[in-house]
Interface confidence: low
């Protein structure tokens, strides 16, 4: 089948004690094999500091998944979501300022 690149969306949600959860969602991609991971200062975080969702069908013949990690508020600029799918890859920053989500479609 044809390759459908993911739509990648990065969001932040506030949690307690000066920490926030940043979530990177990949949706509408095919085939289902994908790498999605958080990087700090350009290097992937260890597995035990990230939480992954299952790769699930989204009802359109494509798939969706997510990865999340907790970071200190004010340190958002150090973190990026790295995506690799069907030979294509991309890096997505955590939105800065008042913007709380960012999405981009890979071609």
């Amino acid at each position: 089948g044809s390759t459908v690149p993911p739509m990648v969306n990065v969001t932040c949600s506030e949690v307690s004690e000066g920490n926030i959860t940043v979530t990177c969602r990949a949706s509408s991609f095919y085939p289902r094999n994908i790498t999605l991971t958080w990087r700090q200062d350009g290097v992937s975080l260890s597995h035990n500091t990230q939480q992954w969702g299952d790769v699930l069908p989204d009802g359109n013949g494509t798939y969706q998944t997510w990865v999340a990690t907790r970071i200190r508020q004010g340190e958002e600029q150090r973190f990026t979501c790295y995506m690799e799918h069907s030979g294509n890859h991309g890096t997505h920053p955590v939105p800065s300022g008042n913007s709380h989500h960012h999405h981009h479609h890979h071609h």
Partner: antibody, heavy 118, light 108 residues
């Protein structure tokens, strides 16, 4: 073998600028950030900032934000650090380094001595 | 800014002796973000220990690291002639990334 090769020593006048290059090899240039650090004679290590070669994101130590400019040329896999409005206290060895696990500096260039003197 | 204070500034020891170097942080940092470097005269720093206690590639087993919170230690169990150098701790937990001022291990 991972190596970072820096440009040669420079002597500059106060008020001028200097641009130091750093050419890594032995790994994919865009896969790790490039850090810049300086060391004044007989002193400790001071972090200037870093650049993500893949997306061009730059993070500066606030102390250098107004005078340092970090850039990359992906076509030649080379990173650059330019420091403007030089003063005598900028005399130092300037190092580039590769980002490692948990924000450490895992490989270093050989250093570039920048001397600022009138 | 997290300030790292190393002590002592200079450590005068003989080959074969044990060296204990301290690094104290002005506020608590995760042990995952504390690293140690060795620098010899005229050379670039070299990563020695990462994440508090993990030896970097090629580093001899006589080096070890420990600590948590605000207090970290680098230990050299039995000094070899090539170990006389300056040692720096570094934190990567918060910006700006900072180094300690260094501890010089010199021959007594």
């Amino acid at each position: 073998e991972i190596q970072l090769v820096q440009s040669g020593a420079e002597v500059k006048k106060p008020g001028s600028s200097v641009k130091v290059s750093c050419k890594p090899s032995g790994y994919a240039f865009t896969s790790n950030n490039i850090y810049w650090v300086r060391q004044a004679p007989g002193q400790g290590l001071e972090w200037i900032g870093y650049i993500d070669p893949y997306i061009g994101r730059i993070i500066y130590n606030q102390q250098f934000k107004d005078r340092a400019t970090l850039t990359v040329d992906k076509s030649t896999s080379t990173a650059y650090m330019e420091l403007s409005s030089l003063r005598s206290e900028d005399t130092a060895v300037y190092y580039c380094s590769r980002s490692g696990e948990r924000s450490n500096f895992d490989y270093w260039g050989q250093g570039t001595l920048v001397t600022v003197s009138s | 800014e997290i300030v790292l204070t190393q002590s002592p500034a200079t450590l005068s020891l003989s080959p074969g002796e044990r060296a204990t170097l301290s690094c104290s942080a002005s506020s608590s940092i995760s042990s995952n973000y504390l690293h140690w470097y060795q620098q010899k005269p005229g050379q670039s720093p070299r990563l020695l220990i990462y994440r508090t206690s993990n030896l970097a590639s090629g580093v001899p087993a006589r080096f070890s690291g420990s600590g948590s919170g605000t207090d970290y230690t680098l230990t050299i169990s039995s000094l070899e002639p090539e170990d006389f150098a300056v040692y720096y701790c570094q934190q990567g937990g918060s910006l700006p990334l900072t180094f300690g001022q260094g501890t010089k291990v010199e021959i007594k």
